[in-house]
């Protein structure tokens, strides 16, 4: 429960939230567990802590490891762990299972595909969507806020959907992609 798996691709932004939630006023300290070394809070660092969030801008394969967050209230300290794995970018179109977020199901009446983890990022529209690496085109596909809506869903719409967006931090832009499977169920 208080150890959370997070993953990303090298040279993309990755933002991880401390699995131990606290009230907004509580301070959060982050450490690299293997060395017990404190993660800096200064934004000039490629990897830095920002309250409940740990930011890799951009991520590198060598960042992989377990990170400890300690949330401190006036009277209690509570610990969480973020298990971070950064993978090399794939040269082909295949998205391996270990990079996939949870599968969502849709039907003719309800076909929303939510872009995983996007709420952690400072992004602005447009959100780009791809299916099996092909950019989605046509009036049946509507990118709305942080999700994709497919009109008149058919069984052929099942597959792997990738959302791509830009995270902005201090005027610099970083790409983020996230992929999940979509299955079509009968009404």
């Amino acid at each position: 429960k208080f150890s959370k798996q997070s993953w990303g691709l090298e040279n993309e932004a990755l933002i991880v939230r401390c699995p131990r939630q606290g009230k907004p006023s509580y301070t959060v300290d982050w450490y690299y567990s293997q060395t017990n070394k404190s993660i800096p809070t200064q934004k000039r660092n490629r990897v830095f802590a920002s309250g409940q969030l740990l930011k890799f801008l951009p991520a590198a394969v060598a960042d992989s490891g377990i990170y400890t967050c300690i949330v401190r209230s006036p009277t209690f300290n509570r610990t969480g762990y973020a298990n971070v794995t950064i993978y090399k970018k794939q040269s082909d179109c295949n998205v391996p299972d270990y990079l996939m977020y949870s599968t969502v199901s849709g039907s003719e009446k309800n076909s929303k595909i939510y872009c995983p983890t996007i709420d952690l990022y400072n992004w602005t529209a447009p959100l780009e969507w791809f299916k099996n690496c092909q950019a989605l085109q046509g009036s049946r596909y509507r990118a709305h806020k942080s999700f994709l809506v497919i009109d008149n869903v058919m069984t052929e719409d099942a597959g792997d959907y990738t959302c791509k967006f830009i995270h902005n931090e201090n005027g610099a832009n970083y790409s983020v992609t996230a992929t999940r499977s979509f299955t079509v169920k009968d009404e």
């Epitope: 429960k1 208080f2 939630q21 606290g22 009230k23 209230s73 009277t75 209690f76 509570r78 610990t79």
Partner: antibody
């Protein structure tokens, strides 16, 4: 100094009603979840009900659901427990307590407790 | 609901001895477990939170351990003021539940 002071207990007949109050001081009442816990004479502790801070979401033990109502008045720093259709098995010392941490969808420990108020349900 | 079973029901020990109290959960509560001490006529007092962290002002002779379903409260050397009833409590999910208590009495 954090203080919780319960009042409103007493003797009531089965089927009757009672309203307990808990006056809080020494902390910013509105941001904390508050809880009622009871203890029957010579028995263990039983969670009764919880209420979120500003959001006000409520939770009840099955044994009191539909009969008890938890509420709060953040402007008065006061927690309430309205108890209706009281039964003999509701006889207990009722404590109010503070959850010092919980965030939406989670719970935590009880770090401060009142001294308790005794509710006796008997004919 | 999650049932917490404490053992033993009563522990008879002398001051200076080590007390080991057990709390077993009917399903995993991760580390969302607390221990309280209650003396006659008083409200419970928080000792341990998140299974192993001492609350503010609690003496170092009190320690908690365990995760998942099996937890232990240890009092390394009993002081006269430690003779009381001890309760475990889970807070992973509602309804919040307590164990039935272990009474630590003077032998």
């Amino acid at each position: 100094e954090v203080q919780l002071l319960e009042s409103g207990g007493g003797l009531v007949q089965p089927g009757g009603s009672l309203r307990l109050s808990c006056a809080a001081s020494g902390f910013t009442f509105s941001i904390y979840d508050m809880i009622w816990v009871r203890q029957a004479p010579g028995k263990g502790l039983e969670w009764v009900s919880s209420i979120r801070g500003e959001g006000g979401g409520t939770y009840y033990a099955d044994s009191v659901k539909g009969r008890f109502t938890i509420s709060r008045d953040n402007s008065k720093n006061t927690l309430y427990l309205q108890m209706n259709s009281l039964r003999a098995e509701d006889t207990a010392v009722y404590y109010c307590a503070r959850d010092p941490w919980s965030t939406e969808g989670s719970f935590f420990v009880l770090d401060y407790w009142g001294q308790g108020t005794l509710v006796t349900v008997s004919s | 609901e999650i049932v917490l079973t404490q053992s033993p029901a009563t522990l008879s020990l002398s001051p200076g001895e080590r007390a080991t109290l057990s709390c077993r959960a009917s399903q995993s509560v991760d580390d969302d477990l607390a221990w309280y001490q209650q003396k006659p006529g008083q409200a419970p007092r928080l000792l341990i939170y998140d299974a192993s962290n001492r609350a503010t002002g609690i003496p170092a002779r009190f320690s908690g351990s365990g995760s998942g379903t099996d937890f232990t409260l240890t009092i390394s050397s009993l002081e006269p003021e430690d003779f009381a009833v001890y309760y475990c409590q889970q807070y992973i999910t509602a309804p919040l539940t307590f164990g039935q208590g272990t009474k630590v009495e003077i032998k």
